[in-house]
């Protein structure tokens, strides 16, 4: 079998809502991944995992279940929704993304993304991580690749 | 408005220990982690930790591991720096300071800790 | 730990001139930097936050930038409250270090 080839694009847009009372953030990010299959033969994206981390923190995680098939050669556009939530100890961070005298208050995230595929019985997990400014501020929408994301050698320490 | 006030100076004798304290107030105490750091005359700065009064979660550098304990009575809004085993080097100014997303936003006045026999 | 590398050490200026100063961090820091004065004798004064964002009564003659692992400060028109001496920070992952300071001194 050739390689199934998973590359995630970035966000594509983040959602916000704050509680006041509760001090605490609301974040739906939208996230992109191409996956591309290599074979002559059709796969199975079975499901896609994902989770986001703040502060090496976890805030959010999702799960997408019997997603799609791509066939042979062919690749498709994925986007998934992951809800994320920032407060309690990190609740401090509310002072930030409300803070009315800055214009963008972006936010470092890490993005962590599985994808398992079938075919034939065999099953693949594939996963990627990055890092990703957000904007915690405001309602976004980004251009593909347009927040920047980087690879990650080494999580944090 | 936010402040962070320290104990005054300290003068003590090598071998000693100290206990400093770093009194918060306008604010909500528990929302923000409060750090700690050295500073030897006319030098930079170094961080020695930080505790999280929400969850009481404390961070220390390594090199400050055995020298430096920090602890908290939320009663008071108080946050303290305890040094042991005190040496010369020992001596410096150490500030309190609140963490804030990308930046230490206020800072105590500062303790002075001279270690003399 | 990440090192963070401050220059010039020191600086010797005319009030009225404009100043940069930069800070390396030895690995990328995603903007998890502040920039702090300190007069002789005082605490440390937050200018800028998350590399780019201004503190509360700051004037803004002050500005922050940059990314990755390269950062700076510039400050326009120097005014004679602005001599002392400045300080990096990186607030990525523990333990936060400082860069060496620049000690800015009237000319």
């Known amino acids: 079998p050739r390689s199934i080839d998973v590359k995630y694009i970035g966000v594509k847009s983040a959602y916000v809502s704050y509680d006041v009372q509760k001090r605490t953030i609301y974040l739906n990010i939208t996230n992109t991944l191409n996956i591309t299959n290599n074979n002559y033969y059709s796969v199975e994206v079975e499901n896609i995992t994902a989770q986001v981390q703040f502060a090496k923190t976890v805030i959010g995680k999702a799960r997408l279940n019997n997603i799609t098939h791509i066939g042979p050669l062919d690749m498709k556009q994925i986007d998934y929704t992951v809800p994320t939530v920032i407060a309690e100890e990190m609740s401090y961070m509310y002072d930030f993304c409300t803070l009315i005298s800055i214009k963008v208050h972006n936010i470092v995230l890490m993005m962590q993304v599985t994808v398992t595929t079938t075919y034939f019985g065999h099953s693949e997990q594939i996963s990627q991580e990055r890092y990703q400014y957000v904007d915690c501020g405001r309602n976004t929408t980004y251009q593909l690749g347009q927040s920047e994301y980087l690879n990650v050698l080494q999580p944090q320490q | 408005q936010v402040q962070l006030q320290q104990s005054g100076a300290e003068l003590v004798k090598p071998g000693a220990s100290v206990k400093m304290s770093c009194k918060a107030s306008g604010y909500t105490f528990t929302t923000f982690p409060i750090e700690w750091m050295k500073q030897n005359h006319g030098k930079s700065l170094e961080w020695i930790g930080n505790f999280h009064p929400y969850n009481d979660d404390t961070k220390y550098n390594e090199k400050f591991k055995g020298k430096a304990t920090l602890t908290v009575e939320k009663s008071s809004s108080t946050v303290y720096l305890e040094l042991s085993r005190l040496t010369s080097d020992d001596s410096a100014v150490y500030y309190c300071a609140r963490y804030f997303y990308g930046g230490m936003d206020y800072w105590g006045q500062g303790t002075s800790v001279t270690v003399s026999s | 730990d990440i090192q963070m590398t401050q220059s010039p050490a020191s600086l010797s200026v005319s009030v009225g001139e404009t100043v940069t100063i930069t800070c390396r961090a030895s690995?990328?820091?995603?903007?998890?930097l502040g920039w702090y004065h300190q007069k002789q004798g005082k605490s440390p004064q937050l200018l800028v936050f998350?590399?780019?964002n201004l503190a509360d009564g700051v004037p803004s003659r002050f500005s922050g930038s940059g990314s990755g692992t390269q950062y700076s400060l510039k400050i326009n028109s120097l005014q004679s409250e602005d001599f002392g001496t400045y300080y990096c920070?990186?607030?990525?992952?523990?333990?936060?270090?400082f860069g060496g300071g620049t000690k800015l001194e009237i000319k």
């Open positions: 920070q990186h607030l990525w992952s523990v333990p936060w270090t």
């Open positions: 690995e990328n820091i995603y903007s998890s």
């Open positions: 998350a590399a780019t």
